[in-house]
Interface confidence: medium
Amino acid sequence: MKNLKELHISSDSFLCDCQLKWLPPWLIGRMLQAFVTATCAHPESLKGQSIFSVPPESFVCDDFLKPQIITQPETTMAMVGKDIRFTCSAASSSSSPMTFAWKKDNEVLTNADMENFVHVHAQDGEVMEYTTILHLRQVTFGHEGRYQCVITNHFGSTYSHKARLTVNVLPSFTKTPHDITIRTTTMARLECAATGHPNPQIAWQKDGGTDFPAARERRMHVMPDDDVFFITDVKIDDAGVYSCTAQNSAGSISANATLTVLET
């Protein structure tokens, strides 16, 4: 911009609000006003005036012609197969036609299932509250991503925050432990495995607690890449109810097995 010699502007649709206050002095300071024909279209009080004849104190933002987001879509987690919705609202003091769009991972959703409406809380459209609701039906993993609403009128577009949708599946057991009866000094073997999204973590308890003899005495072994829980050198006080819990961010499930220990 240092070497700018001429700037040609010819427009009668300037939005003469506080964001344009810088332009006239900038043009004059660089002696670029000769080729500029710029008149205000809004607000109504300045309509038809040249931007150079508008006093600096008249460039104010006392209304909001461009929509302003008032309700952001919220990050959410949903179970596979459930219906969810993202809500986005914007306010505007302009009655200029409004359009609505939703983006997923920065791509516009062309066939979005949207519910759009306006609440006229004040007479003469002083402030209109525009709402767009994106409905996602029977979500799958393909719906995961970041969603953003775009609300646009003649004066510009406003973008909401990006809300993340995570799609989860409750854990379900693929293997559950069975009741067993064994003798002391031998090895007890309990199986437990589960699937889910995200992958569930498996945890074991005895009689409702995590502080039990086999754990304290390091006779308990869980194979990291296996579905088997071992107790070596079984003792009488190892007898009890063992619970396998599979947990992820969607929830948790438990399965019990009773270990009976007989004296050798």
Epitope: T87, P97, V120, H121, I133
Partner: antibody, heavy 127, light 110 residues
Amino acid sequence: EVQLLESGGGLVQPGGSLRLSCAASGFTFSDYDMSWVRQVPGKGLEWVSWISHGGGSIYYADSVKGRFTISRDNSKNTLYLQMNSLRAEDTAVYYCARGLGLCKTGLCYYYDAMDVWGQGTLVTVSS
Amino acid sequence: QSVLTQPPSASGTPGQRVTISCTGSSSNIGNNSVTWYQQLPGTAPKLLIYADNNRPSGVPDRFSGSKSGTSASLAISGLRSEDEADYYCAAWDSSLSAYVFGGGTKLTVL
């Protein structure tokens, strides 16, 4: 003829539940916001709940929040009010009402006004 | 205690003009539009005025609404005996996120 017909009222014990229905006819139900308003006999009107035309937006009066649930089935042209943990002070005539909506240029403008009302259904909460 | 305040009663003779007031705050009447309802004895309410001063079709032009600041009023000119009813003002309250009614005004035609 545009009509709203409430049903489901009756006598229920405190702590009990009741589900009110409002059957709409004579207009495109899915194009309109709907509300429930109640009135203790001989007293004033009290707004209870509001649901947007598509069901995506819902509001409740503080007095019923957490106890009442508004819902709608646009395929059945029916508005519902599920009332749980009922109290003696919930005794009233319950009206369902249609929100005033004017559609133009592909967008519907909803005003804070109710232009069609049902005849009401009486809910009595008493032991 | 209603969020919007109305006089409990008003009266007038046939042909007279009566006015019913409704006082609120900036969170309701001050920034949102006012609606008026008429409730004849033993019937459901009826929409009389919406968006401060608009009449739905079928409502006689004897009924008019106005608003100034945080107050609104309903005027009925050429009072008739069939106007004897309860009148309620209402508005959306932005602070409460709720629709609020006035306590109602019982109009008696003498």
